[in-house]
């Protein structure tokens, strides 16, 4: 039998690679039954997940699936990082994994490099 | 029933080419990492790297960086390994294999296709 | 990267007897998540790996209740407390905490 349990469909050491200046969505996936939890984003800082006030979030509705949507307007260097979506259901807390954002500054590429280089070259991303 | 099955080793030449795939059932691919490994005859097994059907992002071990790449076609659960610039010591059995993102609720291995590079 | 260290390379137990393999990480498998993401795999001669053990101690479906794992941060151990036959394999640990993932070398398991 389906489990009623809140899940929160952010895959391990998933990751995005974005540019400074463009929109971006991320999306925070919920799964759940009867009624939607409160969900927020937060901002991994070392090991401390600083939760995200006064951001634009938007909830997206799909057929079997919700999904909790931090709007970025646009893609700013210092977006660079790691994130999380927390759900609270019935006074317990459920943490997704962390998904990465690399951002690249376009100012600083001469041409807009791959998804893969910008993952696999650090130094072209804002820390 | 949940299936990977491995396909296109064989014979190749050194310095050549070679595209396998790996045909999925049974699950939904982009709920999964998509991994290769491989295993020279009587070795161990080596992570060759890893690709989410889901978005295309892939991640490699660094000795195969340049010379592999790992894609997946979500709407047919295929995926793909290229390999280039093949060296003998490429021969080897090369799996598949497809592990749940989200929970780690499953990890299912393909059967290998054997890959012989050699003049 | 991080290195994978399995003991013993190959251990041969009577049937009914315990198992133990060891597997040593170079450095912590503990994530920042709190999870410890190490795996044991099972491969029986010509055939594929399979997934015995994930995160640690949880076995996989289907896996006997012989099997166990346990272990944190550096150290790991996987026991079969009671040697079957259909036991005899090559074991393999693998991290997949730290990119690249990597594997033990293995240990061959034999019945004495």
């Known amino acids: 039998k389906e489990s009623c349990d809140v899940q929160l469909y952010i895959k391990r050491q998933s990751y995005h690679s974005i540019f400074a200046g463009d929109p971006f969505k991320l999306e925070c996936p919920v799964k759940y039954c009867a009624h939607r939890p409160q969900v927020t984003w937060c901002k991994l800082n070392g090991t401390t997940c600083v939760k995200l006030e006064g951001r634009h979030t938007s909830w997206k509705q799909e057929k079997n699936l919700s999904f909790f949507i931090l709007h970025f307007e646009p893609v700013l260097p210092s977006d660079n990082g790691s994130y999380r979506c927390s759900a609270n259901f019935l006074s317990a807390i459920i943490e997704s994994h962390s998904t990465t954002l690399y951002v690249t500054d376009v100012k600083s590429a001469s041409e807009r490099p791959s998804k893969d280089e910008m993952a696999s070259r650090p130094w072209l991303l804002y820390s | 029933e949940v299936q990977l099955v491995e396909s296109g080793g064989g014979l190749v030449q050194p310095g050549r080419s070679l595209r396998l795939s790996c045909t999925t059932s049974?699950?939904?691919?982009?709920?999964?990492?998509i991994h290769w490994f491989r295993q020279a005859p009587g070795k161990g097994l080596e992570w060759v790297g890893r690709n989410d059907p889901a978005n295309g992002n892939t991640k490699y071990t660094a000795s195969f960086k340049g010379r592999a790449t790992i894609s997946a076609d979500g709407s047919k659960s295929i995926a793909y390994l290229q390999m280039n610039s093949l060296k003998t010591e490429d021969t080897a059995v090369y799996y598949c294999?497809?592990?749940?993102?989200?929970?780690?609720?499953?990890?299912?291995w393909g059967q290998g296709t054997l890959v012989t590079v050699s003049s | 990267d991080i290195v994978m260290t399995q003991s013993p390379d190959s251990l041969a137990v009577s049937l009914g007897e315990r198992a133990t393999i060891n597997c040593k990480s170079s450095?912590?498998?503990?994530?920042?998540?709190?999870?410890?993401?190490l795996n044991w795999l099972q491969q029986k001669p010509g055939q594929s790996p399979k997934r015995l053990i994930y995160l640690v101690s949880k076995l996989d479906s289907g896996v006997p209740d012989r099997f166990s794992g346990s272990g944190s941060g550096t150290d790991f151990t996987l026991t079969i407390s009671s040697l079957q036959a259909e036991d005899l394999a090559v074991y393999y640990c693998w991290q997949d905490t730290h990119f690249p993932y990597t594997f033990g070398q293995g240990t061959k398991l034999e019945i004495k």
């Open positions: 294999a497809s592990y749940e993102g989200y929970y780690e609720r499953f990890g299912y």
């Open positions: 450095q912590s498998l503990l994530d920042r998540d709190g999870k410890t993401y």
């Open positions: 049974g699950f939904n691919i982009k709920d999964t990492y």
